[in-house]
Each structure stands twice: as structure tokens, then as C-alpha cells.
């Protein structure tokens, strides 16, 4: 019996009965938030052998072992993970051992076993036999191994029953509990599973099997399950489903969902039956089960029940994330906010079409409308009173509509209205009339020439750069000295610069009226000598990095025909010089014969230019005498040389500082103080723990359904 799509057991332990007939859970299994300690001994689910996604246990009081609950759980596939983990055991107050003695394979993902104060038998499990890679496992804050005294079956009677493996240079017995060994297959099986009697299973089996070399006797399948057989790929006219089985077209067509996108059903794409077309694809027609590639961003139609969507905060903008067509009207009213321009671009930047009108009013936080960076059509199917489909009123800091050199916007029906936008030049509005095709629709009062742009430098002259010089981390630029009609009106210059990998930035990128600005700004005073051209040295720059730079003249509000005269340059793109690259990363060397070394590394994090070659140097070193000091035939523990592996063991860190003999006459001395790198690693570790805990809480705490 297949259960799914994911089972969430919380609050009441009797809900566990839902697992009674499950052999495969197609999805995840959550058991969590059972605060009353219960006796779980009467609950046993021997049928359950596979979980296709992940297993999460969190705050289940009274549960001491998982072995009785799931004695035959063999495979956790990890098709979908919980924060990169396929097995999470977190804050299980009474858990004494994991006890999943039949767990043989976690196909994808790592394990996270954390903050389980009573949990032992962790150091006796060799996770490398279950997982492909153990480096991402996170086993922290459980009962200290010294307090556990874990003993594998038979060790007390000096008749050990379990097999040994090496973990962290320790060769030891491997077991799940005091009476359950960790199962290992004979080396002759290689990567294959084996039966209870150590006979090798069929290569398509995963975890275990009931008969050797038989693809119909597998407990779980390495690849896919179809009609009772484990197969390497789904047969013709069948499709992969949930990462573990093959289904036919009818099956896929008849899957029902309770999610909002359900009206069109599941699709078949790239040999897989899935809920929706993947990113970059769209259904080939509304009732189609097949996907075709999108031209440009995939359309996503969003509709507002009340017809008009008010955007007055980042939260309200968030609802439009990914939308390309907005059915309704947009009312933008952003009075304040933090980093508002880039947040709005993030959530509204894909909108291409608005079917109704767009109204922007009292949006004092906006400097530009460039956050609507893909808007190309306002249909004006619904209009404001007076037949307006684009209405811009009282936006105290609005300076730019869009960059009309790189923008095509059509307003199909309706007029435009602009009033009380003191920093928005009328020339900018006239340009919009031309681009949008609304010229001639507006009457005289619709674009107010007196209260639009009355506090802006609208009649702009162009500043020309005269020279640029670069080094690896500096740029020196100079420009023509600007001479306004009255030289006393020129106060200073402001230089704006920022990293620009591509030559597509505009003056208003990431800028809002609340202080957020993606440009760095430097003020430049006028040179006292009238014949010297103004200039600046920009320093502290990155090597081999392209920067965008422009300059603005800061002038007095000298009115000429009701408008201020000003000057600014075009945006100049300039790259700093190359420099010495940072060191190559992750250098590893290994010997594959008596006369060869294989050396591998990753490129430097900061190439600071185009890398053309690497230099590898080596030298012979004397043999370490340390290796000859120990009698390797003695039964004493062999000294272990520990090499830094870039991580720190939290368990280790929390112990008291060890004293160690420092050689010669020195006697015992304290552990060395932590290096900056170690402190930083600890800080990052603590941060990572917090992020995971937040993710856990956000994922599992939901309002009561009743």
C-alpha cells in the first residue's frame, strides 16, 4: 500500500494509526509536537519499508527508540529534502537510540541529529554504509559519547556479534542498539544489497531483498519500480513519478490535487509525470498534458479579486512575484520603505501587461518607475474617471519614469495624467507620450507644466570626460569644467560609481528616496584655479572589475523659464587593471604510485584578471621520524595524526580545554587560544544552527485547521 503525499503526525500520538497499512510513504513523514509522554510500545509498523522523501522527528515526548515503530524501514530516498536533509532528529527529549536497524540506504541528502539530550549509539553507526557522502552530516548537541558507554551486542561477553569498520581512524564494532548490529553486506557484493543470509541481491535492488539476484524480490528499487519489477529506466509509454516508480498516461491524467494550480492537472515532460511544467516551460494549450519552451519569461497570469491591487509595501508587492500578466489595476502608493526600489523590482519586475490602469500617487519613496522593468503594455480596459489609464499624482521625489532609450511601452487605450511631481521634468513626460503612442490624447490640463519638474534640473547640459587613467585598484578621471550662465551658481560636482559587470545600468538603478542607492557617491569641490579641469581619484576598487561612473554638477536653483539648469555626464564604463590572483583553493595531493603525485585544486576566488596558467612547485622533504617512534605490533592505541579538515567538531569545542604535554621539561600546558579562523568558523556554525532552527519552526508551525 502506498500512502502519501507526505504524512504529518502531530499533537496526538494516536494519529500514528494512519501508518498502519503503509509499505511506501510517497512523500515525507513528519512525527512532531507530541508533548504528552506516551507508551509507544503498542505501535509497530513493520510494513513500512520506504519513505520517498524525508523523515523528520521533532519534540515527541516519551519515544525512546525508532526501532520498534519502524523495524523494517530500509530506504529513505530523499527525492525532496528538508533543508538538505533526508533524516532530521531534532529536540527528541527522550530518544535513547535511533534503532533503525534495517535502514540500509539514504539515497540523497544528509542527516541532521541535533539537540537530543539523551541520545546515544551515534558513534557506533557507520553512516558511510548508508549514505554516499557523510561530510554534510550534522550530529551535534546530543548526549556526550563519554556518558553513553555504548556497547554493541556480545561485547560484554567477549563474543562480539557485530562487524567492525573504521570511522575517523577508529576501528570499531558497528551497531544500532545494545542488541542490534548494523548490517553489512559481503565485499563480494560491491555496491549491491544483500539478503539476511548475505546473498547478493539483483543490481537493481536497493537496501535489501528477499531472494538473491531477483529483480522482483527487492525491498526497494535502485532506480524505478514498475509492475512488481525493479527497472533501470521506465519502459516505453510509462513515466517517472515521484522519483521512484513508473506510471502510465492515464494514471498521470487522473492525479487530483488540492493546490491552486490544480485546474489543469498533472503534466508529462521529459519522461516524467509532474504537477506543473518546469521553469522555462508552459503547457501546450490549457487542457494539454505536455509542455513546450516559453519564449522569454513564462507567462503567469495574476488576478486581483477586488480588481485594483494596492501596492503600499514590500509585502503587498510580494503577492505579484513571478506575475507577467496582471488582470486588473495597479495602484502604487509607496510612502516609505527600506531598499524599496530593488525589493519592488524583485517582486514586480516580471510584469509585462496590465489589463486595467496604472495609478502612482503619494509615492514619495520612489525616484524612478524602472522597477517595472518589463512593463510593455497597459491595455486600459478599465480606466479612471476622466478616461485615464496612466495617472501620476503627487510623487515628491519621482525623477525618472523609465529609460526611454531601452524601453517600449504601449498604452492601448486611455489618457495620461501628471500633476505635482516636482522633480519630474516635463520633457520626460513628453518623451513618454511619444513612446507610448498617447500623443494627442491628452488635453491641456492633463500634463501640468508648472507643478511637474519645478524643483529639478530639467535643462541639462552634458559634461564630457577628458581623461581616464586606471591601475589595479584605482581610477583617475577628469572632466570639462562646466560653466553655467552665472559661474556663481556652480557649487560642486558629485561623482557616482558602482561595479557594473554589464553595460546596462541606469542612473536610477536601485535608488529610492529613503536613502537606498546602489551607487557610491563622492563630492568633488571646484578646483580653485579656473583653468584646471575638475577630477577625482577613486580608490579601494577591485582589480579587473568594470565600473560605471557618471558625474553631476551641483547647481543653485537658478530659474530660467521656471526651470533649473543643470549638467551631468553620460555613464562611462571603465575597467580596472588586472592584478595578482588570490591563492588557488582546496589544494589536494595524493599518490597513485611510488613515483607519482596527483595534485588537484580549485581556481582562486578572486582571479583579478584572466587566468592563463598555474605554476606548480614541489620539493622533496625528509621522511618524518615520528612514524618510526611507535611499535605498531603493540596493542596500545596507534597514535593518530589529525589533519585540519576545515571544519570544527562542536562536541569537541564544548569540552574543557585539554592539557597536553608540550615536550621536554615543559610539563603540561593549556590548550592554545583559538585562532581568528576558528572563532569565525564557530560564529558561522552558530549562525547556521540558527538558520536551520528558524527554517524548521517556519516549516512546521501552522495554524490549527479547525
Amino acid at each position: 500500500e502506498i500512502c502519501g503525499p507526505g504524512i504529518d503526525i502531530r499533537n496526538d500520538y494516536q494519529q500514528l494509526k494512519r501508518l498502519e497499512n503503509c509499505t511506501v510513504i510517497e512523500g515525507y513523514l513528519h512525527i512532531l509536537l507530541i508533548s504528552k509522554a506516551e507508551d509507544y510500545r503498542s505501535y509497530r509498523f513493520p510494513k513500512l519499508t520506504v519513505i520517498t522523501e524525508y523523515l523528520l522527528l521533532f519534540r515527541v515526548a516519551g519515544l525512546e527508540s525508532l526501532g520498534d515503530l519502524f523495524p523494517n524501514l530500509t530506504v529513505i530516498r530523499g527525492w525532496k529534502l528538508f533543508y538538505n536533509y533526508a533524516l532530521v532528529i531534532f529536540e527528541m527529549t527522550n530518544l535513547k537510540d535511533i534503532g533503525l536497524y534495517n535502514l540500509r540506504n539514504i539515497t540523497r541528502g544528509a542527516i541532521r541529529i541535533e539537540k537530543n539530550a539523551d541520545l546515544c549509539y551515534l558513534s557506533t553507526v557507520d553512516w558511510s554504509l548508508i549514505l554516499d557522502a557523510v561530510s554534510n552530516n550534522y550530529i551535534v548537541g546530543n548526549k556526550p559519547p563519554k556518558e553513553c558507554g555504548d556497547l554493541c551486542p556480545g561485547t560484554m561477553e567477549e563474543k562480539p556479534m557485530c562487524e567492525k569498520t573504521t570511522i575517523n581512524n577508529e576501528y570499531n564494532y558497528r551497531c544500532w542498539t545494545t542488541n542490534r548490529c548494523q548490517k553489512m553486506c559481503p565485499s563480494t557484493c560491491g555496491k549491491r544489497a544483500c539478503t539476511e543470509n548475505n546473498e547478493c541481491c539483483h543490481p537493481e535492488c536497493l537496501g535489501s531483498c528477499s531472494a538473491p539476484d531477483n529483480d522482483t524480490a527487492c525491498v526497494a528499487c535502485r532506480h524505478y519500480y514498475y509492475a512488481g519489477v525493479c527497472v533501470p529506466a521506465c519502459p516505453p509509454n510509462t513515466y517517472r513519478f515521484e522519483g521512484w516508480r513508473c506510471v502510465d498516461r492515464d494514471f498521470c491524467a487522473n492525479i487530483l490535487s488540492a493546490e491552486s494550480s490544480d485546474s489543469e492537472g498533472f503534466v508529462i515532460h521529459d519522461g516524467e509525470c509532474m504537477q506543473e511544467c518546469p521553469s522555462g516551460f508552459i503547457r501546450n494549450g490549457s487542457q494539454s498534458m505536455y509542455c513546450i519552451p516559453c519564449e522569454g519569461p513564462c507567462p503567469k497570469v495574476c488576478e486581483e479579486e477586488k480588481k485594483t491591487k494596492t501596492i503600499d509595501s514590500v509585502t503587498s508587492a510580494q503577492m505579484l512575484q513571478g506575475c507577467t500578466i496582471f488582470k486588473g489595476n495597479l495602484l502604487i502608493n509607496i510612502r516609505r520603505g527600506n531598499n524599496i526600489a530593488s525589493e519592488l523590482e524583485n517582486f514586480m519586475g516580471l510584469i509585462e501587461v496590465v489589463t486595467g490602469y496604472v495609478k502612482i500617487r503619494h509615492s514619495h519613496a520612489l525616484v524612478s518607475l524602472s522597477f517595472l522593468k518589463n512593463l510593455r503594455l497597459i491595455l486600459g480596459e478599465e480606466q479612471l474617471e476622466g478616461n485615464y489609464s496612466f495617472y501620476v499624482l503627487d510623487n515628491q521625489n519621482l525623477q525618472q519614469l523609465w529609460d526611454w532609450d531601452h524601453r517600449n511601452l504601449t498604452i492601448k487605450a486611455g489618457k495620461m495624467y501628471f500633476a505635482f511631481n516636482p522633480k519630474l521634468c516635463v520633457s520626460e513626460i513628453y518623451r513618454m507620450e511619444e513612446v507610448t503612442g498617447t500623443k494627442g490624447r491628452q488635453s491641456k490640463g492633463d500634463i501640468n507644466t508648472r507643478n511637474n519638474g519645478e524643483r529639478a534640473s530639467c535643462e541639462s547640459d552634458v559634461l564630457h570626460f577628458t581623461s581616464t587613467t586606471t591601475s589595479k585598484n584605482r581610477i583617475i578621471i577628469t572632466w570639462h569644467r562646466y560653466r553655467p550662465p552665472d559661474y556663481r551658481d556652480l557649487i560642486s560636482f558629485t561623482v557616482y560609481y558602482k561595479e557594473a559587470p554589464f553595460k546596462n545600468v541606469t542612473e536610477y538603478d536601485g535608488q529610492d528616496a529613503c536613502g537606498s542607492n546602489s551607487w557610491n557617491m563622492v563630492d568633488v569641490d571646484l578646483p580653485p584655479n579656473k583653468d584646471v579641469e575638475p577630477g577625482i581619484l577613486l580608490h579601494g576598487l577591485k582589480p579587473w572589475t568594470q565600473y560605471a561612473v557618471y558625474v553631476k554638477a551641483v547647481t543653485l536653483t537658478m530659474v530660467e523659464n521656471d526651470h533649473i539648469r543643470g549638467a551631468k555626464s553620460e555613464i562611462l564604463y571603465i575597467r580596472t587593471n588586472a592584478s595578482v590572483p588570490s591563492i588557488p583553493l582546496d589544494v589536494l595531493s595524493a599518490s597513485n604510485s611510488s613515483s607519482q603525485l596527483i595534485v588537484k585544486w580549485n581556481p582562486p576566488s578572486l582571479p583579478n584578471g584572466n587566468l592563463s596558467y598555474y605554476i606548480v612547485r614541489w620539493q622533496r622533504q625528509p621522511q618524518d621520524g615520528y612514524l618510526y617512534r611507535h611499535n605498531y605490533c603493540s596493542k596500545d592505541k596507534i597514535p593518530i595524526r589529525k589533519y585540519a579538515d576545515g571544519t570544527i567538531d562542536i562536541e569537541e569545542v564544548t569540552e574543557n580545554p585539554k592539557t597536553e604535554v608540550c615536550g621536554g621539561e615543559k610539563g603540561p600546558c593549556c590548550a592554545c587560544p583559538k585562532t581568528e579562523a576558528e572563532k569565525q568558523a564557530e560564529k558561522e556554525e552558530a549562525e547556521y544552527r540558527k538558520v536551520f532552527e528558524n527554517f524548521l519552526h517556519n516549516s512546521i508551525f501552522v495554524p490549527r485547521p479547525e
Epitope: L256, D262, P705, E706
Partner: nanobody
Framework: EVQLVESGGGLVQPGGSLRLSCAAS????????MSWFRQAPGKGLEFVSA????????NYADSVKGRFTISRDNSKNTLYLQMNSLRAEDTAVYYC????????????????WGQGTLVTVSS
């Protein structure tokens, strides 16, 4: 936990009609796929029909296609089964079931079940 209560069962003559209802206690009713199953005397559990969360899509067993119609009213947290042209072989206890998020055609292990309502078709 979601409570489900079926009603509307009873005795009906062959060829007659009956409408079953299933009231759910959950305020997130639309986030469940809902289903009707039945169990005839001395037989196993049989799938009858299922409906998606929004009510836009439905599946039926071959034995009831064209005669039974499943529907739901999410504002009233209620599931319905309209049964027309009833036959003697439709006699069974009818169970309403709910599963969160999704239901595949082979799913019988639904998360929540009602107690059942008896439908008897006899002359």
C-alpha cells in the same frame, strides 16, 4: 484532526436517486482532495469517486460513470455525491475520505475517514 460526517443514506428503489453529503470540520477544506468509497456486504473497500480541492476536476470508477456526480461546496465545507439510476449492486456503506494536498488514482490510504452511511437499493 479533521472530522467527517456522512448523511443522506437510506432505502431507495432501483432506478431511483439519492444525494449523499459529507460535512467536514476543517476550515481549510479546500486543501483536501475528497473522495467517496463504498463497501458492499461481505466485500472489500471500493473506490467510487474523487474530486480536486477546487472542485474543477473529478474521477469516477467505471461502474458508476455517467450515473454518479461528485461535487463540493468549499464555502460550506461539504462534499456531495449525487447518485442517479441506482442499481441493486450499488447497495453498500458509503464512506467519505479526505487527503491533504493530493491523491493518486491508486491511493486507498486516505488520511481521514467518516463513519459511513448505508445506502440500500431494493424493490
Amino acid at each position: 484532526e479533521v472530522q467527517l460526517v456522512e448523511s443522506g443514506g437510506g432505502l431507495v428503489q432501483p432506478g431511483g436517486s439519492l444525494r449523499l453529503s459529507c460535512a467536514a470540520s476543517s476550515r481549510t477544506f479546500s486543501s483536501f482532495v475528497m473522495s467517496w468509497f463504498r463497501q458492499a456486504p461481505g466485500k472489500g473497500l471500493e473506490f467510487v469517486s474523487a474530486i480536486s480541492g477546487s472542485g474543477s476536476r473529478a474521477n469516477y470508477a467505471d461502474s458508476v460513470k455517467g450515473r454518479f456526480t461528485i461535487s463540493r461546496d468549499n464555502s460550506k465545507n461539504t462534499l456531495y455525491l449525487q447518485m442517479n439510476s441506482l442499481r441493486a449492486e450499488d447497495t453498500a456503506v458509503y464512506y467519505c475520505a479526505a487527503n491533504p494536498r493530493r491523491a493518486t488514482p491508486d491511493l486507498t490510504q486516505y488520511a481521514y475517514w467518516g463513519q459511513g452511511t448505508l445506502v440500500t437499493v431494493s424493490s
